[in-house]
C-alpha cells in the first residue's frame, strides 16, 4: 500500500509526505520582564520562558534572545496573547488637562525579522485604546494567523509598554508558532 | 512511489505518517447553562453541544460531562470564545456602594485535568476588568494556543460567572480542539 | 518503506495520506472598502487583498468577489481579525439623546454560503458593546475556529459598520483559512 494510492487526484507528486510529529513547534510563556532599552517609536520585545511549565520548543524550532528562529520554510500558524494591566487611567472630561499618566493605547505586534531584509515586517497587530474609569484595569489582546515563512526568519512579540504586561501567570501571556 | 521517498532529510523514520482526516477533532457550541454547584474560589465549567448545528466530535475525540476527552497523545491546538453580557456596571467613585449587579471582571479559563495529577492545570486564561458605563454591555474573550497533551487528559472551559455567558447563538460562544 | 507501516493501529486505510504543502490555504489582508449596497438588517461583507504584501492564496483556494472559495471538502481552521476605530461614543445618562455618531456595538461575522442552501450560515461572531468615554477609540475583534466545509462553500467576513473598519494596515485587519 503506497502513500500515493489514496491521494486525491490533485496531489502533486513533488510535495513531500511529512510526519506531523516531526514539525517545528513552540509555545512560549511569559516571564518577568527586565529593563529594556527603548527607543522612540520602537516597541520593546518581550522575552519568554521556553522550557518550564507549559512552555516548549521542538523539532529544531529554537528560542534565543527574544526570538523564535524558524528552522525550515513553510506556512506557519503564529499566535500570541498579551494580558495588560495597569492602575487608574483617567481619560474622561478631565482628559484635556493632558495628564502624563494615561496610556493612550495598548498594542501587541508580532514581528518577523529576515536578516537579508533591512526592515522588520509587522505580521500581526492588535491595538486598543485604553480609557478605563475603574481604579485597576486588565485585559488581553489575542492575535493569530498563518504566514509563509522562510528558513532563518525570526519572530518576536513587541508591546507598546513593557511595564503594563501581566507576567504573573503562564496562561495569561504567551507566544507560539507551528508549521502547518 | 513510497511515502518516504520525498521526505525532507530531517524526517525521522520513527515518526508515523498519518492521514489528516483521521485526527481527533472537536468543535463544541454553547447551550443554555443549568445551575451548577461550584465551590468558593473555583470557576464553574460550561457544558456544550457536541453534535447539533456546527458542533461535532470525530475520530475518537469524545465529549462527556463538560469535558473533551483526549484520545491520543500529541500536540493539540485548543481554542474557545465566550461572549459575556451583563447589565450596567458602574465602577467609578460610587463603586464602594457595592452594587450586586457589577462583576469586577470576566474570566475564561481552559483547564486540563489529568487523572494521575491531583490539581487541574490552567492552560489558557483570558481575563478582563469590566467597568462599563452603558446600561447593557456584551463582549467576547477569545483564547487559542497549542499544548502537548496525553491520552486520557480532559479539557474543560471554566468561567468566572456562568450567569453572564451569552448562550443565545452557537457562533458566539464555542470551544474546540484538534490534533496537529 | 510504505506509508502505512508506521501508522498507529487506529488509522483507517481509506484515509488518504496527504502532503501538507499541497493543502488549500489563504491569508487575506484589508484594503480600503468601497461603498457597498447593503440591505437593512444585513451586515455588509468586506473585500480583501489576496496577493500583495502578506496576502496569499494557494493550492486552489481562490478569492473572488469578497468570497474565499473552498476547493475541497474537509476540516478548515478559519480566522479573522477586524480592527474598528471611531470617534467619541458617549453612552451614559445622555445616551437617550440618540447621537448619530455613536455605534451601540461593533460586530464581526464569518459567514458560510452554500449554493444549495438558501440561507447563509453564521460560523463565528464577535460582538462588543461600544461605550467609550475617550475622544477616539479603536479596538480589534478576533475570531478563529475549526469547521467542516464542503467543496464549493464560500466564506466571507461581514461587519456591522464598514465605515468603522481600520483599513490602514495589513496586520490590523485580516481573514484566513487553511485545510487541516
Amino acid at each position: 500500500l503506497k502513500g500515493q494510492e489514496f491521494a486525491p487526484s490533485h496531489q502533486q507528486v513533488y510535495a513531500p509526505l511529512r510526519a506531523d510529529g516531526d514539525k517545528p513547534r513552540a509555545h512560549l510563556t511569559v516571564v518577568r520582564q527586565t529593563p529594556t532599552q527603548h527607543f522612540k517609536n520602537q516597541f520593546p520585545a518581550l522575552h519568554w520562558e521556553h522550557e518550564l511549565g507549559l512552555a516548549f520548543t521542538k523539532n529544531r524550532m529554537n528560542y534565543t534572545n527574544k526570538f523564535l528562529l524558524i528552522p525550515e520554510s513553510g506556512d506557519y500558524f503564529i499566535y500570541s496573547q498579551v494580558t495588560f494591566r495597569g492602575m487608574t487611567s483617567e481619560c474622561s472630561e478631565i482628559r484635556q488637562a493632558g495628564r502624563p499618566n494615561k496610556p493612550d493605547s495598548i498594542t501587541v505586534v508580532i514581528t518577523k525579522v529576515t536578516d537579508s531584509y533591512p526592515e522588520p515586517t509587522q505580521l500581526l497587530m492588535g491595538t486598543k485604546s485604553v480609557c478605563e474609569v475603574g481604579s485597576n484595569w486588565f485585559q488581553p489582546i489575542y492575535l493569530g494567523a498563518m504566514f509563509s515563512l522562510q528558513e532563518g526568519d525570526k519572530l518576536m512579540v513587541n508591546v507598546s509598554d513593557i511595564s503594563l504586561v501581566d507576567y504573573t501567570k503562564e496562561d495569561k501571556t504567551f507566544f507560539g508558532a507551528f508549521l502547518l | 512511489l513510497k511515502g518516504q521517498e520525498f521526505a525532507p532529510s530531517h524526517q525521522q523514520v520513527y515518526a508515523p505518517l498519518r492521514a489528516d482526516g483521521d485526527k481527533p477533532r472537536a468543535h463544541l457550541t454553547v447551550v443554555r447553562q443549568t445551575p451548577t454547584q461550584h465551590f468558593k474560589n473555583q470557576f464553574p465549567a460550561l457544558h456544550w453541544e457536541h453534535e447539533l448545528g456546527l458542533a461535532f466530535t470525530k475520530n475518537r475525540m469524545n465529549y462527556t460531562n463538560k469535558f473533551l476527552l483526549i484520545p491520543e497523545s500529541g500536540d493539540y491546538f485548543i481554542y474557545s470564545q465566550v461572549t459575556f453580557r451583563g447589565m450596567t456596571s458602574e465602577c467609578s467613585e460610587i463603586r464602594q456602594a457595592g452594587r450586586p449587579n457589577k462583576p469586577d471582571s470576566i474570566t475564561v479559563v481552559i483547564t486540563k485535568v489529568t487523572d494521575s495529577y491531583p490539581e487541574p492545570t490552567q492552560l489558557l486564561m483570558g481575563t478582563k476588568s469590566v467597568c462599563e458605563v452603558g446600561s447593557n454591555w456584551f463582549q467576547p474573550i477569545y483564547l487559542g494556543a497549542m499544548f502537548s497533551l496525553q491520552e486520557g487528559d480532559k479539557l474543560m472551559v471554566n468561567v468566572s460567572d456562568i450567569s453572564l455567558v451569552d448562550y443565545t447563538k452557537e457562533d458566539k460562544t464555542f470551544f474546540g480542539a484538534f490534533l496537529l | 518503506l510504505k506509508g502505512q507501516e508506521f501508522a498507529p493501529s487506529h488509522q483507517q486505510v481509506y484515509a488518504p495520506l496527504r502532503a501538507d504543502g499541497d493543502k488549500p490555504r489563504a491569508h487575506l489582508t484589508v484594503v480600503r472598502q468601497t461603498p457597498t449596497q447593503h440591505f437593512k438588517n444585513q451586515f455588509p461583507a468586506l473585500h480583501w487583498e489576496h496577493e500583495l504584501g502578506l496576502a496569499f492564496t494557494k493550492n486552489r483556494m481562490n478569492y473572488t468577489n469578497k468570497f474565499l472559495l473552498i476547493p475541497e471538502s474537509g476540516d478548515y481552521f478559519i480566522y479573522s481579525q477586524v480592527t474598528f476605530r471611531g470617534m467619541t461614543s458617549e453612552c451614559s445618562e445622555i445616551r437617550q439623546a440618540g447621537r448619530p455618531n455613536k455605534p451601540d456595538s461593533i460586530t464581526v461575522v464569518i459567514t458560510k454560503v452554500t449554493d444549495s442552501y438558501p440561507e447563509p450560515t453564521q460560523l463565528l461572531m464577535g460582538t462588543k458593546s461600544v461605550c467609550e468615554v475617550g475622544s477616539n477609540w479603536f479596538q480589534p475583534i478576533y475570531l478563529g475556529a475549526m469547521f467542516s466545509l464542503q467543496e464549493g462553500d464560500k466564506l466571507m467576513v461581514n461587519v456591522s459598520d464598514i465605515s468603522l473598519v481600520d483599513y490602514t494596515k495589513e496586520d490590523k485587519t485580516f481573514f484566513g483559512a487553511f485545510l487541516l
Epitope: T34, G86, K102, S163 | - | -
Partner: antibody, heavy 120, light 107 residues
Framework: EVQLVESGGGLVQPGRSLRLSCAAS????????MHWVRQAPGKGLEWVSG????????GYADSVKGRFTISRDNAKNSLYLQMNSLRAEDTAVYYC?????????????WGQGTLVTVSS | DIQMTQSPSTLSASVGDRVTITCRAS??????LAWYQQKPGKAPKLLIY???SLESGVPSRFSGSGSGTEFTLTISSLQPDDFATYYC?????????FGGGTKVEIK
Amino acid sequence: EVQLVESGGGLVQPGRSLRLSCAASGFTFDDYAMHWVRQAPGKGLEWVSGISWNSGSIGYADSVKGRFTISRDNAKNSLYLQMNSLRAEDTAVYYCAKGQVAPLDHFDYWGQGTLVTVSS
Amino acid sequence: DIQMTQSPSTLSASVGDRVTITCRASQSISSWLAWYQQKPGKAPKLLIYDASSLESGVPSRFSGSGSGTEFTLTISSLQPDDFATYYCEQYNSYPLTFGGGTKVEIK
C-alpha cells in the same frame, strides 16, 4: 550603589498641603516603577501610591485617592508626592521605594523616609 | 482588595532557634509575595521575593516557601541581627498590600 533620599516632610495643619520629593541615584531611574509607602507611628506598612517608568500607569490607595498626586521627572531622577487636604491620619513616615519594570511588583530598595506630621 | 494576615504578631525566640512566620492571603496570589525586615527607626529591607527567591546579599538562613494563599518565612538559625519586625507583601493585584507585621523579640 542605589540611593533614595526623601525630603519635604514636616509639621503641617489639617487641610493644608505638602510636597514630598525623592532623589534617586545609582540606577537607571527611567527603567523602573517607583512607589510611596508610609508607616504611621507604631503601625505597619501601607502602600500609598505607585507610578510606572513612563507615568503611563498610576495608582493610589483608596485612603489617599483624590487628595494625593504622584509624579516623576525622569530627567531629574526624581519622584514626587503632592499631598493635599491633609488629615491627622496621614501622619506617618513616608518612604520612597524602587520597584521593578512593572508597577505591580516588590520593592528592592527603600529610602530612609521623611516624617509628615499633620496636627493643629 | 487582598488582605494579608500575618501570624503570630509577636514571637519570642532565642539565638539559634528555628523561626517560622506565616502569611495568609485572602485569595490566591500565586507566588507573588515578598518578605521584608525592618528594624526600629530604619527603612524596610527586602529579604525574599516571588515567595522563595532570596534577594542578593541576604544570608541563606532566610528562606521562603508557599504558593496560593499560604506562605512562610523561615529563619533556620536565629542570629542576634535578626531581631526585628517582618512584613509580607502581595503584588498579585492592585492595590499592593502588606501583612500587619510579626515582631521577633528576644526570649
